[in-house]
Protein backbone atom coordinates (compact mmCIF):
# COMPACT_ATOMS: atom_id res chain seq x y z
CA UNK A 1 0.00 0.00 0.00
CA UNK A 2 1.35 3.40 -0.93
CA UNK A 3 -0.76 5.55 1.37
CA UNK A 4 0.85 7.20 4.39
CA UNK A 5 0.82 5.29 7.66
CA UNK A 6 -2.14 5.89 9.95
CA UNK A 7 -1.06 7.87 13.00
CA UNK A 8 -2.37 6.62 16.29
CA UNK A 9 -1.69 8.31 19.67
CA UNK A 10 -1.78 6.61 23.04
CA UNK A 11 -1.29 7.64 26.65
CA UNK A 12 1.57 6.17 28.66
CA UNK A 13 0.07 3.37 30.76
CA UNK A 14 -3.14 3.42 28.75
CA UNK A 15 -4.45 1.29 25.87
CA UNK A 16 -4.52 1.78 22.13
CA UNK A 17 -6.03 0.00 19.13
CA UNK A 18 -4.43 -0.12 15.68
CA UNK A 19 -7.60 -0.67 13.63
CA UNK A 20 -7.91 -2.89 10.55
CA UNK A 21 -10.90 -2.41 8.26
CA UNK A 22 -11.63 -6.08 7.63
CA UNK A 23 -15.29 -6.83 7.09
CA UNK A 24 -16.95 -9.78 8.82
CA UNK A 25 -17.48 -11.75 5.59
CA UNK A 26 -13.81 -11.50 4.46
CA UNK A 27 -12.21 -14.95 4.53
CA UNK A 28 -8.86 -14.61 6.26
CA UNK A 29 -6.03 -17.08 5.99
CA UNK A 30 -3.87 -15.30 8.58
CA UNK A 31 -2.74 -11.89 9.83
CA UNK A 32 0.80 -11.11 10.90
CA UNK A 33 1.49 -8.02 12.97
CA UNK A 34 5.04 -6.65 12.77
CA UNK A 35 6.23 -4.18 15.43
CA UNK A 36 8.93 -1.51 15.54
CA UNK A 37 11.69 -4.15 15.81
CA UNK A 38 10.30 -7.49 14.68
CA UNK A 39 7.23 -9.67 14.16
CA UNK A 40 4.90 -9.45 17.09
CA UNK A 41 1.93 -11.68 16.64
CA UNK A 42 0.37 -14.22 14.34
CA UNK A 43 -3.38 -14.79 14.16
CA UNK A 44 -5.50 -17.37 12.30
CA UNK A 45 -9.27 -17.80 12.37
CA UNK A 46 -10.53 -20.00 15.20
CA UNK A 47 -7.01 -20.34 16.67
CA UNK A 48 -5.26 -18.71 19.60
CA UNK A 49 -3.09 -15.70 18.85
CA UNK A 50 0.60 -16.43 18.90
CA UNK A 51 2.65 -13.63 20.55
CA UNK A 52 6.26 -13.65 19.53
CA UNK A 53 7.77 -10.86 21.65
CA UNK A 54 8.08 -11.39 25.37
CA UNK A 55 7.62 -7.70 26.32
CA UNK A 56 4.10 -7.73 24.82
CA UNK A 57 2.90 -10.81 26.70
CA UNK A 58 -0.25 -10.06 28.64
CA UNK A 59 -0.50 -6.65 27.02
CA UNK A 60 -1.33 -7.51 23.44
CA UNK A 61 -4.52 -8.81 21.90
CA UNK A 62 -5.99 -9.16 18.43
CA UNK A 63 -9.71 -8.61 17.99
CA UNK A 64 -11.81 -11.52 16.66
CA UNK A 65 -13.33 -10.29 13.41
CA UNK A 66 -11.29 -7.25 12.41
CA UNK A 67 -7.87 -8.54 13.53
CA UNK A 68 -7.07 -5.05 14.93
CA UNK A 69 -4.11 -4.92 17.30
CA UNK A 70 -4.82 -3.84 20.90
CA UNK A 71 -1.93 -2.92 23.20
CA UNK A 72 -2.60 -2.16 26.85
CA UNK A 73 -0.36 -0.71 29.60
CA UNK A 74 1.54 1.27 26.98
CA UNK A 75 5.21 2.04 27.49
CA UNK A 76 7.34 4.67 25.73
CA UNK A 77 9.18 1.77 24.01
CA UNK A 78 5.95 0.74 22.29
CA UNK A 79 6.10 3.83 20.09
CA UNK A 80 7.12 3.28 16.45
CA UNK A 81 6.00 1.73 13.17
CA UNK A 82 3.56 -1.18 13.05
CA UNK A 83 2.56 -3.15 10.02
CA UNK A 84 -0.26 -5.63 9.52
CA UNK A 85 0.20 -8.24 6.74
CA UNK A 86 -3.22 -9.59 5.77
CA UNK A 87 -3.41 -12.83 3.82
CA UNK A 88 -6.84 -13.68 2.44
CA UNK A 89 -7.95 -17.15 1.49
CA UNK A 90 -7.80 -17.86 -2.27
CA UNK A 91 -6.04 -14.54 -2.76
CA UNK A 92 -2.34 -14.59 -3.54
CA UNK A 93 -1.56 -10.90 -2.84
CA UNK A 94 -0.72 -9.91 0.75
CA UNK A 95 -2.39 -6.67 1.82
CA UNK A 96 -0.40 -4.37 4.13
CA UNK A 97 -1.65 -1.70 6.53
CA UNK A 98 0.91 0.62 8.18
CA UNK A 99 0.58 2.54 11.41
CA UNK A 100 2.75 4.94 13.39
CA UNK A 101 2.15 4.77 17.12
CA UNK A 102 3.03 7.72 19.34
CA UNK A 103 2.99 7.25 23.09
CA UNK A 104 2.59 10.42 25.14
CA UNK A 105 2.64 11.03 28.83
CA UNK A 106 -0.43 12.48 30.50
CA UNK A 107 0.69 16.05 31.21
CA UNK A 108 1.26 17.20 34.77
CA UNK A 109 0.09 20.63 35.87
CA UNK A 110 2.24 23.27 34.17
CA UNK A 111 4.47 25.36 36.42
CA UNK A 112 4.82 29.09 35.78
CA UNK A 113 8.03 30.73 36.91
CA UNK A 114 9.09 34.34 36.70
CA UNK A 115 12.24 34.56 34.59
CA UNK A 116 12.95 38.28 34.75
CA UNK A 117 11.58 41.69 35.63
CA UNK A 118 12.81 44.80 33.87
CA UNK A 119 11.69 48.23 34.98
CA UNK A 120 11.20 50.56 32.06
CA UNK A 121 10.10 54.16 31.63
CA UNK A 122 6.74 55.55 32.75
CA UNK A 123 6.60 53.32 35.83
CA UNK A 124 6.07 50.19 33.73
CA UNK A 125 7.53 46.73 34.12
CA UNK A 126 8.35 44.02 31.61
CA UNK A 127 7.78 40.67 33.28
CA UNK A 128 8.87 37.45 31.58
CA UNK A 129 7.05 34.29 32.62
CA UNK A 130 8.08 30.77 31.65
CA UNK A 131 5.71 27.84 31.50
CA UNK A 132 7.00 24.28 31.70
CA UNK A 133 5.70 20.80 32.32
CA UNK A 134 7.84 18.39 34.29
CA UNK A 135 9.01 15.39 32.29
CA UNK A 136 7.43 16.51 29.02
CA UNK A 137 9.80 18.00 26.52
CA UNK A 138 8.40 17.07 23.13
CA UNK A 139 5.13 17.72 21.36
CA UNK A 140 3.87 20.14 23.99
CA UNK A 141 2.07 23.24 22.83
CA UNK A 142 1.74 26.18 25.21
CA UNK A 143 -0.80 28.98 25.22
CA UNK A 144 -1.69 31.76 27.64
CA UNK A 145 -4.90 33.41 28.73
CA UNK A 146 -5.89 36.17 28.71
CA UNK A 147 -4.51 37.07 25.30
CA UNK A 148 -3.58 40.72 25.65
CA UNK A 149 -2.20 43.39 23.33
CA UNK A 150 0.63 44.21 25.77
CA UNK A 151 1.68 40.56 26.14
CA UNK A 152 3.76 38.59 23.64
CA UNK A 153 4.54 34.87 23.42
CA UNK A 154 7.79 33.30 22.31
CA UNK A 155 9.66 29.97 22.32
CA UNK A 156 6.67 28.01 21.08
CA UNK A 157 4.41 29.82 23.49
CA UNK A 158 6.23 28.66 26.60
CA UNK A 159 7.49 32.19 27.34
CA UNK A 160 5.19 35.15 27.91
CA UNK A 161 6.41 38.74 28.24
CA UNK A 162 3.94 41.11 29.82
CA UNK A 163 4.29 44.86 29.94
CA UNK A 164 2.26 46.51 32.71
CA UNK A 165 2.05 49.49 35.03
CA UNK A 166 0.68 49.33 38.59
CA UNK A 167 -2.44 50.99 37.18
CA UNK A 168 -3.26 48.05 34.90
CA UNK A 169 -5.65 45.48 36.36
CA UNK A 170 -3.67 42.65 37.88
CA UNK A 171 -5.18 39.93 35.72
CA UNK A 172 -4.51 36.28 36.53
CA UNK A 173 -2.44 34.71 33.74
CA UNK A 174 -2.99 31.01 33.08
CA UNK A 175 -0.71 28.81 31.02
CA UNK A 176 -2.29 25.87 29.21
CA UNK A 177 -0.08 23.00 28.05
CA UNK A 178 -1.39 20.59 25.45
CA UNK A 179 -0.15 17.42 23.80
CA UNK A 180 -2.14 15.02 21.61
CA UNK A 181 -3.51 13.12 24.60
CA UNK A 182 -4.04 15.69 27.34
CA UNK A 183 -4.46 19.31 28.25
CA UNK A 184 -3.63 20.90 31.61
CA UNK A 185 -3.77 24.43 32.93
CA UNK A 186 -1.54 26.11 35.50
CA UNK A 187 -2.69 27.86 38.61
CA UNK A 188 -3.42 31.55 37.92
CA UNK A 189 -0.41 33.83 38.34
CA UNK A 190 -0.79 37.52 39.22
CA UNK A 191 2.15 39.35 37.70
CA UNK A 192 1.57 42.45 39.82
CA UNK A 193 3.40 40.79 42.68
CA UNK A 194 6.62 40.71 40.62
CA UNK A 195 6.54 44.39 39.87
CA UNK A 196 6.26 46.22 43.17
CA UNK A 197 8.82 48.97 42.64
CA UNK A 198 8.28 50.30 39.12
CA UNK A 199 10.18 53.53 39.02
CA UNK A 200 9.82 54.00 42.76
CA UNK A 201 13.55 54.31 43.18
CA UNK A 202 13.74 56.92 40.40
CA UNK A 203 10.66 59.09 40.12
CA UNK A 204 7.88 60.39 42.25
CA UNK A 205 7.77 62.63 45.26
CA UNK A 206 10.38 62.37 47.97
CA UNK A 207 9.60 59.67 50.45
CA UNK A 208 7.91 60.51 53.70
CA UNK A 209 8.59 58.51 56.85
CA UNK A 210 5.73 57.45 59.09
CA UNK A 211 6.28 56.03 62.56
CA UNK A 212 3.90 53.32 63.75
CA UNK A 213 3.41 51.47 67.01
CA UNK A 214 3.25 47.69 67.00
CA UNK A 215 -0.36 46.57 67.43
CA UNK A 216 -1.78 50.05 66.82
CA UNK A 217 -3.34 51.57 63.69
CA UNK A 218 -1.47 53.83 61.29
CA UNK A 219 -2.30 55.94 58.24
CA UNK A 220 0.10 56.29 55.33
CA UNK A 221 -0.72 59.59 53.63
CA UNK A 222 -1.23 60.20 49.96
CA UNK A 223 -2.14 63.86 50.53
CA UNK A 224 -4.48 63.73 47.57
CA UNK A 225 -7.28 66.27 48.11
CA UNK A 226 -9.22 65.20 45.01
CA UNK A 227 -9.12 61.52 45.87
CA UNK A 228 -12.80 61.00 45.07
CA UNK A 229 -12.25 62.20 41.49
CA UNK A 230 -9.29 59.91 40.96
CA UNK A 231 -9.90 57.00 38.62
CA UNK A 232 -7.82 54.60 40.64
CA UNK A 233 -5.15 54.55 43.34
CA UNK A 234 -2.83 51.60 43.81
CA UNK A 235 -0.65 51.03 46.87
CA UNK A 236 2.16 48.50 46.55
CA UNK A 237 4.06 46.85 49.38
CA UNK A 238 6.30 43.82 48.92
CA UNK A 239 4.10 41.50 46.85
CA UNK A 240 0.87 43.09 48.01
CA UNK A 241 -1.37 45.24 45.86
CA UNK A 242 -4.01 47.35 47.58
CA UNK A 243 -6.15 49.40 45.23
CA UNK A 244 -9.12 51.73 45.21
CA UNK A 245 -11.21 52.16 42.07
CA UNK A 246 -13.48 55.14 41.64
CA UNK A 247 -16.96 54.77 43.17
CA UNK A 248 -15.96 51.58 44.90
CA UNK A 249 -14.81 50.56 48.32
CA UNK A 250 -11.09 50.11 48.47
CA UNK A 251 -10.13 46.49 48.07
CA UNK A 252 -7.04 44.44 48.49
CA UNK A 253 -6.24 42.29 45.49
CA UNK A 254 -8.05 38.93 45.82
CA UNK A 255 -4.62 37.36 46.05
CA UNK A 256 -3.92 39.53 49.06
CA UNK A 257 -7.35 39.29 50.61
CA UNK A 258 -7.00 35.59 51.15
CA UNK A 259 -3.55 35.91 52.64
CA UNK A 260 -3.68 36.23 56.40
CA UNK A 261 -1.11 38.99 57.03
CA UNK A 262 -3.24 41.56 55.24
CA UNK A 263 -6.70 40.08 55.71
CA UNK A 264 -9.13 42.83 56.75
CA UNK A 265 -6.26 44.89 58.19
CA UNK A 266 -5.45 47.10 55.24
CA UNK A 267 -7.65 49.37 53.19
CA UNK A 268 -7.50 52.53 51.13
CA UNK A 269 -9.49 55.47 52.46
CA UNK A 270 -12.16 56.66 50.06
CA UNK A 271 -11.83 60.14 51.59
CA UNK A 272 -8.19 60.90 50.83
CA UNK A 273 -6.81 57.70 49.29
CA UNK A 274 -4.44 57.23 52.24
CA UNK A 275 -3.55 53.67 53.22
CA UNK A 276 -4.93 52.56 56.56
CA UNK A 277 -3.42 49.65 58.46
CA UNK A 278 -4.92 48.44 61.69
CA UNK A 279 -3.08 46.37 64.29
CA UNK A 280 0.41 46.88 62.92
CA UNK A 281 2.73 43.88 62.70
CA UNK A 282 6.51 44.06 62.54
CA UNK A 283 6.42 42.69 58.99
CA UNK A 284 4.33 45.68 57.85
CA UNK A 285 7.41 47.90 58.10
CA UNK A 286 9.12 48.96 54.89
CA UNK A 287 8.64 51.02 51.75
CA UNK A 288 5.14 51.62 50.38
CA UNK A 289 4.50 53.05 46.94
CA UNK A 290 1.29 54.77 45.88
CA UNK A 291 0.38 55.26 42.22
CA UNK A 292 -2.37 57.58 41.04
CA UNK A 293 -3.90 56.36 37.79
CA UNK A 294 -5.62 58.04 34.88
CA UNK A 295 -8.64 56.69 32.99
CA UNK A 296 -6.25 55.27 30.41
CA UNK A 297 -4.50 53.27 33.16
CA UNK A 298 -1.34 55.32 32.98
CA UNK A 299 0.45 56.53 36.12
CA UNK A 300 -0.15 60.24 36.68
CA UNK A 301 1.87 60.49 39.90
CA UNK A 302 3.53 58.39 42.55
CA UNK A 303 4.50 58.79 46.18
CA UNK A 304 6.56 56.63 48.46
CA UNK A 305 6.21 56.33 52.19
CA UNK A 306 8.52 54.45 54.51
CA UNK A 307 6.80 52.88 57.49
CA UNK A 308 8.89 52.38 60.63
CA UNK A 309 7.40 50.25 63.39
CA UNK A 310 8.45 50.24 67.02
CA UNK A 311 7.08 48.37 69.98
CA UNK A 312 5.94 50.00 73.20
CA UNK A 313 8.65 49.59 75.81
CA UNK A 314 8.12 47.45 78.86
CA UNK A 315 9.14 48.69 82.29
CA UNK A 316 12.93 48.73 82.57
CA UNK A 317 14.66 46.41 84.99
CA UNK A 318 17.34 47.77 87.32
CA UNK A 319 19.90 45.36 88.73
CA UNK A 320 22.62 46.38 91.16
CA UNK A 321 25.78 45.03 92.69
CA UNK A 322 27.70 46.37 95.65
CA UNK A 323 31.25 47.19 94.62
CA UNK A 324 32.40 47.96 98.16
CA UNK A 325 31.36 49.81 101.23
CA UNK A 326 34.15 51.30 103.34
CA UNK A 327 35.20 54.61 104.89
CA UNK A 328 31.50 55.33 105.23
CA UNK A 329 31.18 55.45 101.41
CA UNK A 330 28.80 53.13 99.61
CA UNK A 331 29.72 52.32 96.01
CA UNK A 332 27.33 50.39 93.74
CA UNK A 333 26.99 49.49 90.06
CA UNK A 334 23.57 49.85 88.48
CA UNK A 335 22.37 48.34 85.21
CA UNK A 336 19.14 49.41 83.54
CA UNK A 337 17.74 47.33 80.67
CA UNK A 338 14.50 46.74 78.79
CA UNK A 339 13.39 43.34 77.55
CA UNK A 340 12.66 43.24 73.77
CA UNK A 341 13.73 46.87 73.54
CA UNK A 342 15.48 46.60 70.19
CA UNK A 343 18.43 48.72 69.17
CA UNK A 344 16.75 52.14 69.27
CA UNK A 345 16.39 52.35 73.03
CA UNK A 346 17.95 55.31 74.79
CA UNK A 347 18.43 55.51 78.55
CA UNK A 348 18.41 58.53 80.84
CA UNK A 349 18.88 58.67 84.59
CA UNK A 350 17.25 61.32 86.75
CA UNK A 351 18.66 63.18 88.54
CA UNK A 352 20.86 63.49 85.42
CA UNK A 353 23.92 61.22 85.59
CA UNK A 354 26.50 62.16 82.98
CA UNK A 355 28.71 59.15 83.77
CA UNK A 356 26.18 56.57 82.58
CA UNK A 357 27.52 54.28 79.84
CA UNK A 358 25.33 52.39 77.37
CA UNK A 359 26.58 49.12 75.97
CA UNK A 360 24.82 46.09 74.49
CA UNK A 361 21.41 47.71 74.93
CA UNK A 362 21.89 48.38 78.65
CA UNK A 363 22.78 51.47 80.67
CA UNK A 364 25.50 51.07 83.26
CA UNK A 365 26.03 53.55 86.07
CA UNK A 366 28.42 53.63 89.02
CA UNK A 367 27.22 55.66 92.00
CA UNK A 368 28.63 56.34 95.41
CA UNK A 369 27.49 58.28 98.48
CA UNK A 370 28.54 58.85 102.06
CA UNK A 371 26.51 57.32 104.82
CA UNK A 372 25.98 60.82 106.19
CA UNK A 373 24.39 61.92 102.92
CA UNK A 374 20.85 61.30 101.72
CA UNK A 375 20.49 58.05 99.82
CA UNK A 376 20.21 58.83 96.12
CA UNK A 377 16.89 57.84 94.57
CA UNK A 378 17.55 57.31 90.89
CA UNK A 379 15.06 56.79 88.06
CA UNK A 380 16.04 55.06 84.85
CA UNK A 381 13.91 56.03 81.85
CA UNK A 382 14.09 53.95 78.69
CA UNK A 383 12.87 55.70 75.54
CA UNK A 384 12.29 54.71 71.92
CA UNK A 385 10.57 56.72 69.20
CA UNK A 386 7.09 55.71 70.37
CA UNK A 387 7.20 55.26 74.13
CA UNK A 388 8.97 55.81 77.41
CA UNK A 389 9.09 53.69 80.49
CA UNK A 390 10.63 54.42 83.89
CA UNK A 391 11.75 52.52 86.94
CA UNK A 392 12.78 54.10 90.23
CA UNK A 393 15.69 52.65 92.17
CA UNK A 394 15.54 53.12 95.93
CA UNK A 395 19.01 52.81 97.50
CA UNK A 396 18.26 53.29 101.18
CA UNK A 397 18.75 49.71 102.45
CA UNK A 398 21.78 48.78 100.39
CA UNK A 399 24.62 49.93 102.63
CA UNK A 400 22.69 50.27 105.90
CA UNK A 401 24.03 48.90 109.18
CA UNK A 402 27.30 49.60 111.05
CA UNK A 403 30.50 49.06 109.06
CA UNK A 404 28.97 46.68 106.55
CA UNK A 405 31.56 45.56 104.07
CA UNK A 406 29.68 42.92 102.18
CA UNK A 407 30.01 42.36 98.43
Amino acid sequence: KDSAPTVVSGILGGSVTLPLNISVDTEIENVIWIGPKNALAFARPKENVTIMVKSYLGRLDITKWSYSLCISNLTLNDAGSYKAQINQRNFEVTTEEEFTLFVYEQLQEPQVTMKSVKVSENFSCNITLMCSVKGAEKSVLYSWTPREPHASESNGGSILTVSRTPCDPDLPYICTAQNPVSQRSSLPVHVGQFCTDPGASRGGTTGETVVGVLGEPVTLPLALPACRDTEKVVWLFNTSIISKEREEAATADPLIKSRDPYKNRVWVSSQDCSLKISQLKIEDAGPYHAYVCSEASSVTSMTHVTLLIYRRLRKPKITWSLRHSEDGICRISLTCSVEDGGNTVMYTWTPLQKEAVVSQGESHLNVSWRSSENHPNLTCTASNPVSRSSHQFLSENICSGPERNTK
Epitope: V213, T348, P385, S387
Partner: antibody, heavy 122, light 110 residues
Framework: QMQLVESGAEVKKPGSSVKVSCKAS????????ISWVRQAPGQGLEWMGG????????NYAQKFQGRVTITADKSTSTAYMELSSLRSEDTAVYYC???????????????WGQGTLVTVSS | QSGLTQPRSVSGSPGQSVTISCTGT?????????VSWYQQHPGKAPKLMIY???KRPSGVPDRFSGSKSGNTASLTVSGLQAEDEADYYC??????????FGSGTKLTVL
Protein backbone atom coordinates in the same frame (compact mmCIF):
# COMPACT_ATOMS: atom_id res chain seq x y z
CA GLN B 1 10.18 74.45 85.05
CA MET B 2 10.48 74.43 81.27
CA GLN B 3 9.34 77.48 79.32
CA LEU B 4 8.54 77.69 75.62
CA VAL B 5 8.98 80.92 73.71
CA GLU B 6 7.67 81.15 70.14
CA SER B 7 8.69 83.43 67.30
CA GLY B 8 6.71 86.53 66.37
CA ALA B 9 3.58 86.99 64.27
CA GLU B 10 3.78 86.48 60.51
CA VAL B 11 1.79 87.68 57.52
CA LYS B 12 2.05 85.42 54.48
CA LYS B 13 0.73 85.24 50.94
CA PRO B 14 -1.33 82.23 49.77
CA GLY B 15 0.88 79.54 48.26
CA SER B 16 3.91 80.53 50.32
CA SER B 17 5.41 78.81 53.39
CA VAL B 18 5.83 79.82 57.01
CA LYS B 19 8.34 78.58 59.57
CA VAL B 20 7.55 79.11 63.26
CA SER B 21 10.16 78.48 65.96
CA CYS B 22 9.76 77.40 69.58
CA LYS B 23 12.70 77.82 71.95
CA ALA B 24 12.77 75.80 75.16
CA SER B 25 14.53 76.83 78.35
CA UNK B 26 14.73 75.49 81.89
CA UNK B 27 14.57 71.77 81.08
CA UNK B 28 16.28 68.94 79.21
CA UNK B 29 14.98 69.72 75.73
CA UNK B 30 15.95 66.47 74.05
CA UNK B 31 14.20 64.30 76.64
CA UNK B 32 10.77 65.67 75.85
CA UNK B 33 8.42 65.70 72.91
CA ILE B 34 7.25 68.92 71.29
CA SER B 35 3.74 69.14 69.80
CA TRP B 36 2.39 71.76 67.44
CA VAL B 37 -1.26 72.74 67.82
CA ARG B 38 -3.14 75.40 65.89
CA GLN B 39 -6.30 77.36 66.58
CA ALA B 40 -8.11 79.27 63.85
CA PRO B 41 -10.00 82.41 64.97
CA GLY B 42 -13.06 81.39 66.97
CA GLN B 43 -12.32 77.71 66.34
CA GLY B 44 -11.05 74.75 68.37
CA LEU B 45 -7.61 73.27 68.87
CA GLU B 46 -6.09 71.08 66.18
CA TRP B 47 -3.10 68.78 66.76
CA MET B 48 -0.78 69.11 63.76
CA GLY B 49 2.08 66.84 64.77
CA GLY B 50 5.18 66.73 66.86
CA UNK B 51 8.80 65.72 67.21
CA UNK B 52 10.86 63.76 69.70
CA UNK B 53 14.21 65.60 69.61
CA UNK B 54 16.22 62.77 71.19
CA UNK B 55 15.34 60.53 68.21
CA UNK B 56 14.64 63.19 65.60
CA UNK B 57 11.45 61.37 64.63
CA UNK B 58 8.41 63.43 63.69
CA ASN B 59 4.77 62.43 63.69
CA TYR B 60 2.04 64.21 61.77
CA ALA B 61 -1.73 64.36 61.86
CA GLN B 62 -3.10 62.88 58.67
CA LYS B 63 -4.68 66.17 57.65
CA PHE B 64 -1.33 67.98 57.54
CA GLN B 65 0.86 65.16 56.26
CA GLY B 66 2.83 66.25 53.23
CA ARG B 67 2.32 69.95 53.97
CA VAL B 68 3.91 70.30 57.39
CA THR B 69 7.52 69.62 58.40
CA ILE B 70 8.53 69.57 62.05
CA THR B 71 12.22 69.66 62.97
CA ALA B 72 14.31 70.24 66.08
CA ASP B 73 17.77 71.60 66.76
CA LYS B 74 19.07 70.07 69.97
CA SER B 75 22.06 72.42 70.13
CA THR B 76 19.78 75.46 70.47
CA SER B 77 16.86 73.66 72.17
CA THR B 78 14.58 74.91 69.41
CA ALA B 79 11.76 73.18 67.56
CA TYR B 80 10.45 74.37 64.20
CA MET B 81 7.18 73.93 62.34
CA GLU B 82 7.07 74.71 58.63
CA LEU B 83 3.74 74.78 56.82
CA SER B 84 3.78 75.02 53.03
CA SER B 85 1.21 75.81 50.31
CA LEU B 86 -0.52 78.25 52.63
CA ARG B 87 -4.17 79.13 52.08
CA SER B 88 -6.44 81.61 53.83
CA GLU B 89 -7.89 78.90 56.08
CA ASP B 90 -4.40 78.39 57.59
CA THR B 91 -4.80 81.75 59.35
CA ALA B 92 -4.50 80.73 63.00
CA VAL B 93 -2.54 80.94 66.21
CA TYR B 94 0.12 78.23 66.20
CA TYR B 95 1.16 76.87 69.59
CA CYS B 96 4.03 74.62 70.57
CA UNK B 97 3.62 72.44 73.65
CA UNK B 98 5.98 70.12 75.53
CA UNK B 99 5.42 67.05 77.68
CA UNK B 100 7.27 67.78 80.91
CA UNK B 101 6.15 64.62 82.64
CA UNK B 102 7.97 61.49 81.53
CA UNK B 103 4.82 59.52 80.80
CA UNK B 104 4.90 56.26 78.85
CA UNK B 105 3.69 58.00 75.68
CA UNK B 106 4.79 61.18 73.93
CA UNK B 107 3.00 64.44 73.16
CA UNK B 108 1.30 64.97 76.48
CA UNK B 109 0.94 68.76 76.29
CA UNK B 110 1.92 69.97 79.78
CA UNK B 111 3.63 73.27 79.00
CA TRP B 112 2.52 75.61 76.20
CA GLY B 113 4.17 78.45 74.31
CA GLN B 114 2.47 81.81 74.04
CA GLY B 115 1.36 81.15 70.46
CA THR B 116 2.28 82.69 67.10
CA LEU B 117 -0.37 84.34 64.94
CA VAL B 118 0.06 83.49 61.26
CA THR B 119 -2.14 85.47 58.88
CA VAL B 120 -2.51 84.28 55.30
CA SER B 121 -3.81 87.00 53.06
CA SER B 122 -3.31 88.17 49.50
CA GLN C 1 -8.43 61.30 62.66
CA SER C 2 -11.67 63.24 62.84
CA GLY C 3 -12.19 65.26 66.00
CA LEU C 4 -13.81 64.10 69.21
CA THR C 5 -17.35 65.29 69.91
CA GLN C 6 -18.07 67.67 72.78
CA PRO C 7 -21.20 69.65 73.64
CA ARG C 8 -20.95 73.25 72.38
CA SER C 9 -21.71 74.71 75.78
CA VAL C 10 -22.55 73.84 79.38
CA SER C 11 -23.43 76.14 82.24
CA GLY C 12 -23.88 76.07 85.98
CA SER C 13 -24.24 78.35 88.97
CA PRO C 14 -21.39 78.94 91.42
CA GLY C 15 -20.99 76.00 93.80
CA GLN C 16 -22.76 73.61 91.42
CA SER C 17 -21.19 70.71 89.47
CA VAL C 18 -21.06 70.41 85.70
CA THR C 19 -19.91 67.55 83.51
CA ILE C 20 -18.51 67.88 79.99
CA SER C 21 -18.53 64.80 77.78
CA CYS C 22 -16.08 63.88 75.06
CA THR C 23 -17.10 61.12 72.67
CA GLY C 24 -14.69 59.35 70.37
CA THR C 25 -14.30 55.86 68.96
CA UNK C 26 -12.59 52.63 69.90
CA UNK C 27 -9.59 53.90 67.91
CA UNK C 28 -9.00 56.84 70.23
CA UNK C 29 -10.88 57.45 73.52
CA UNK C 30 -12.07 53.86 73.85
CA UNK C 31 -8.79 52.28 72.83
CA UNK C 32 -6.37 53.97 75.23
CA UNK C 33 -6.35 55.47 78.72
CA UNK C 34 -4.62 58.57 77.39
CA VAL C 35 -7.30 61.25 77.57
CA SER C 36 -6.37 64.81 78.60
CA TRP C 37 -8.44 67.90 79.33
CA TYR C 38 -7.35 71.51 78.72
CA GLN C 39 -8.74 74.80 79.95
CA GLN C 40 -8.40 77.89 77.75
CA HIS C 41 -9.29 81.41 78.76
CA PRO C 42 -9.87 83.94 75.94
CA GLY C 43 -6.62 85.13 74.37
CA LYS C 44 -4.53 82.72 76.45
CA ALA C 45 -2.71 79.45 75.74
CA PRO C 46 -4.44 76.24 76.87
CA LYS C 47 -3.61 74.80 80.29
CA LEU C 48 -3.47 71.08 81.13
CA MET C 49 -6.09 70.17 83.74
CA ILE C 50 -6.32 66.35 83.56
CA TYR C 51 -4.15 63.71 81.91
CA UNK C 52 -4.34 59.92 81.60
CA UNK C 53 -8.15 60.10 82.01
CA UNK C 54 -8.19 61.08 85.69
CA LYS C 55 -4.77 62.33 86.87
CA ARG C 56 -4.32 65.94 87.93
CA PRO C 57 -1.08 67.85 87.42
CA SER C 58 0.21 69.65 90.50
CA GLY C 59 -1.43 73.01 90.99
CA VAL C 60 -4.79 71.97 89.53
CA PRO C 61 -7.58 72.13 92.13
CA ASP C 62 -9.18 68.82 93.10
CA ARG C 63 -12.53 70.28 92.00
CA PHE C 64 -11.53 69.05 88.55
CA SER C 65 -11.88 65.30 87.97
CA GLY C 66 -11.88 63.04 84.95
CA SER C 67 -13.34 59.66 84.10
CA LYS C 68 -14.00 57.42 81.12
CA SER C 69 -16.57 54.82 80.12
CA GLY C 70 -16.27 53.05 76.79
CA ASN C 71 -15.73 55.59 74.02
CA THR C 72 -16.75 58.57 76.15
CA ALA C 73 -14.56 60.55 78.56
CA SER C 74 -15.93 63.11 81.00
CA LEU C 75 -14.61 66.14 82.88
CA THR C 76 -16.46 67.10 86.04
CA VAL C 77 -16.01 70.50 87.65
CA SER C 78 -17.54 70.60 91.12
CA GLY C 79 -17.99 73.64 93.31
CA LEU C 80 -18.05 75.94 90.27
CA GLN C 81 -16.19 79.21 90.60
CA ALA C 82 -16.25 82.29 88.41
CA GLU C 83 -12.66 81.68 87.22
CA ASP C 84 -13.70 78.27 85.84
CA GLU C 85 -15.54 80.05 83.02
CA ALA C 86 -13.49 79.13 79.93
CA ASP C 87 -13.33 76.84 76.92
CA TYR C 88 -12.52 73.20 77.68
CA TYR C 89 -10.98 70.78 75.20
CA CYS C 90 -10.47 67.05 75.51
CA UNK C 91 -7.70 65.28 73.64
CA UNK C 92 -6.97 61.61 73.13
CA UNK C 93 -4.15 59.48 71.89
CA UNK C 94 -5.23 58.04 68.53
CA UNK C 95 -2.60 55.37 67.88
CA UNK C 96 0.92 55.40 66.48
CA UNK C 97 2.04 58.65 68.13
CA UNK C 98 -0.90 60.76 66.96
CA UNK C 99 -3.40 62.83 68.95
CA UNK C 100 -6.81 64.26 68.30
CA PHE C 101 -8.66 67.12 70.02
CA GLY C 102 -12.31 67.55 70.84
CA SER C 103 -14.43 70.28 69.29
CA GLY C 104 -14.40 72.31 72.52
CA THR C 105 -17.03 73.25 75.11
CA LYS C 106 -17.76 76.70 76.45
CA LEU C 107 -18.38 76.57 80.20
CA THR C 108 -20.44 79.49 81.48
CA VAL C 109 -20.72 80.22 85.20
CA LEU C 110 -24.12 81.83 85.69
Amino acid sequence: QMQLVESGAEVKKPGSSVKVSCKASGGTFSSYAISWVRQAPGQGLEWMGGIIPIFGTANYAQKFQGRVTITADKSTSTAYMELSSLRSEDTAVYYCAADMELRDYYYGMDVWGQGTLVTVSS
Amino acid sequence: QSGLTQPRSVSGSPGQSVTISCTGTSSDVGGYNYVSWYQQHPGKAPKLMIYDVSKRPSGVPDRFSGSKSGNTASLTVSGLQAEDEADYYCSSYAGSNTFVFGSGTKLTVL
